[in-house]
């Protein structure tokens, strides 16, 4: 049994038909010695009476908010989660795997620049009595802080039958160093708690790894004189780390004709223009990716040739 | 060229180099969505690798401000990778493909470190551990690990030189 | 879903040579290292050969086939061979394409993997 926080404590159990559970003493938090009585949750069933109560928790039921009283009166409360391990593996009831990049995906990152400002999120069909607890550092033997805010519901989605809903939380890093090279990677753990049950999620990764520009902006055509050529030319994103000459990016210049089977004309450069022959109904598109490290594309930004 | 002295180094032509530095990273050892080192071995193998630090003055200001410290770092590093590249951990069991782009950058990394340090002059470089695990497949984790770490590291280089090129050339 | 489909095994002499090729289902091919496996009956299961395009690319060959055998493959194919040379009775067993898309050849090299295939019969008479 371990202090989730002050008087919130979880329970770790071995989850198996007929597992013999975990002996938990509780102790009343008072200078009292006499008189006290013990109830669970909502009942007015006396479970026990002293300064400590023992009990035997095996299953959910055995689960809730331990209070002792003196005489009509509550003395403290004591509040008992679960954490469910089975076969060696703690659950993951809570959360949905998110199964990309890889499976056992439950949280997802990315940053727009390497300010060491990140967002994670996750996905779960839960919609009431949830919580959730954001911490984090950069490596864990000796680790350097990073300021996480609340999670928010941040999304809802119809999937089918159910609807799923989207947490997000914004991290920071207490004292980032854009220019370096990371060693040590970012850790983010977040502890989730539905009714009675608890299980914690982490992920750990370096800020290069999750970075995700965002997409080009002022993206504009330009036709050139005779010719069923236009000049493209966009912008660096405002998000994007300064100065640019520094922090570079490269471009994947697309044109794409109204049907998706249409061959796709793909252009990649350096630069924040390139030249490009417009056909009919097609649209021009641009993406941007940290020029010297393999990270994510942004998304696409878009016109219309016409 | 960065001589210990203090001179300018050949920005465009570092710039060029690193840049193509990070391209042969990437091609020796591609980004695989679903892949996480950190899922290979527990073991940290990887520790040893010189990084580009804060303090090592690689960003814009410090390099406006001394750019020598930067590129000691940066030569210590292409010094300690071409050793690397050059040992047993990729010279032994499993063979590199004939096509590998395990050579070129090998090469690219002695190269750059040349036009940073031309000969006769010495900065103190790191020694090498001495990793030469005895099973294939350890040796091909080892690779992994060291690429990936490369990759971060000619990174950070090629920004080095890309500004250096754009606002510190003569 | 990876799915594996051998073929070009069959029945040769001592000395012979046979090639046979593996077709892999998904585009996750060149992610991933591929290899060849073989199994005798009665006997424990035995690493052939594998090729991978991580960590520089690599080329492995099991201790018995070294010299003998030659592992490639055609990414555009989505395709892996092995061409086996101075086949001897003892390289009879079945042979089996495998894939490892998690740790791209590490899996293979410890002699384990994601996927295999259904496998191919190899008989090597005297």
């Known amino acids: 049994i371990w202090e989730l926080k002050k008087d919130v404590y979880v329970v770790e159990l071995d989850w198996y038909p007929d597992a013999p559970g975990e002996m938990v003493v509780l102790t009343c938090d008072t200078p009292e010695e006499d008189g006290i009585t013990w109830t669970l949750d909502q009942s007015s069933e006396v479970l026990g009476s002293g300064k400590t109560l023992t009990i035997q928790v095996k299953e959910f039921g055995d689960a809730g908010q331990y209070t002792c009283h003196k005489g009509g009166e509550v003395l403290s409360h004591s509040l008992l989660l679960l954490h469910k391990k089975e076969d060696g593996i703690w659950s993951t009831d809570i959360l949905k795997d998110q199964k990309e990049p890889k499976n056992k995906t439950f949280l997802r990152c990315e940053a727009k620049n390497y300010s060491g400002r990140f967002t994670c999120w996750w996905l779960t069909t839960i919609s009431t009595d949830l919580t959730f607890s954001v911490k984090s550092s950069r490596g864990s033997s000796d680790p350097q802080g990073v300021t996480c805010g609340a999670a928010t519901l941040s999304a809802e989605r119809v999937r089918g039958d159910n609807k799923e809903y989207e947490y997000s939380v914004e991290c920071q890093e207490d004292s980032a160093c854009p220019a370096a090279e990371e060693s040590l990677p970012i850790e983010v753990m977040v502890d989730a708690v539905h009714k009675l049950k608890y299980e914690n999620y982490t992920s750990s990764f370096f800020i290069r790894d999750i970075i995700k520009p965002d997409p080009p902006k002022n993206l504009q055509l330009k036709p050139l004189k005779n010719s069923r050529q236009v000049e493209v030319s966009w912008e660096y994103p405002d998000t994007w780390s300064t100065p640019h000459s520094y922090f570079s990016l490269t471009f994947c210049v697309q044109v794409q004709g109204k049907s998706k089977r249409e061959k796709k004309d793909r252009v990649f450069t350096d630069k924040t223009s390139a030249t490009v022959i417009c056909r009919k109904n097609a649209s021009i598109s641009v993406r941007a990716q940290d020029r010297y490290y393999s990270s994510s594309w942004s998304e696409w930004a878009s016109v219309p040739c016409s | 060229r960065a001589v210990p002295g203090g001179s300018s180094p050949a920005w465009t032509q570092c710039q060029q180099l690193s840049q193509k530095l990070c391209t042969l990273a990437w091609s020796a050892h591609p980004l695989v969505g679903h892949m996480d080192l950190r899922e290979e071995g527990d073991e940290e193998t990887t520790n040893d690798v010189p990084h580009i630090q804060c303090g090592d003055g690689c960003d814009p200001q410090g390099l406006r401000d001394n750019s020598q410290f930067c590129l000691q770092r940066i030569h210590q590093g292409l010094i300690f990778y071409e050793k690397l590249l050059g040992s047993d951990i990729f010279t032994g069991e499993p063979s590199l493909l004939p096509d590998s782009p395990v050579g070129q950058l090998h090469a690219s990394l002695l190269g750059l470190s040349q036009l940073l340090q031309p000969e006769g002059h010495h900065w103190e470089t790191q020694q090498i551990p001495s990793l030469s695990p005895s099973q294939p497949w350890q040796r091909l984790l080892l690779r992994f690990k060291i690429l990936r770490s490369l990759q971060a590291f000619v990174a950070v280089a090629a920004r080095v030189f890309a500004h250096g090129a754009a606002t510190l050339s003569p | 879903e990876v799915q594996l489909v051998e073929s070009g095994g069959g029945l040769v002499q001592a000395g012979g040579s046979l090639r046979l090729s593996c077709v892999a289902s998904?585009?996750?091919?060149?992610?991933?290292?591929m290899g060849w496996f073989r199994q005798a009956p009665g006997k424990e299961r035995e690493f052939v050969a594998a090729?991978?395009?991580?960590?520089?690319?690599?080329?492995h060959y099991g201790d018995s086939v070294k010299g003998r055998f030659t592992i490639s493959a055609d990414n555009g194919k989505n395709t892996v061979y092995l061409q086996m040379n101075s086949l001897k009775p003892e390289d009879t067993a079945v042979y089996y394409c495998?894939?490892?898309?998690?740790?791209?050849?590490?899996?293979?090299?410890?002699?384990?993997?994601?996927?295999r295939g259904q496998g191919t019969q190899v008989t090597v008479s005297s």
């Open positions: 495998a894939a490892d898309s998690r740790l791209r050849g590490i899996a293979l090299l410890k002699g384990s993997y994601d996927y």
């Open positions: 998904e585009r996750t091919f060149s992610s991933s290292a």
């Open positions: 090729i991978g395009w991580s960590g520089g690319g690599f080329i």
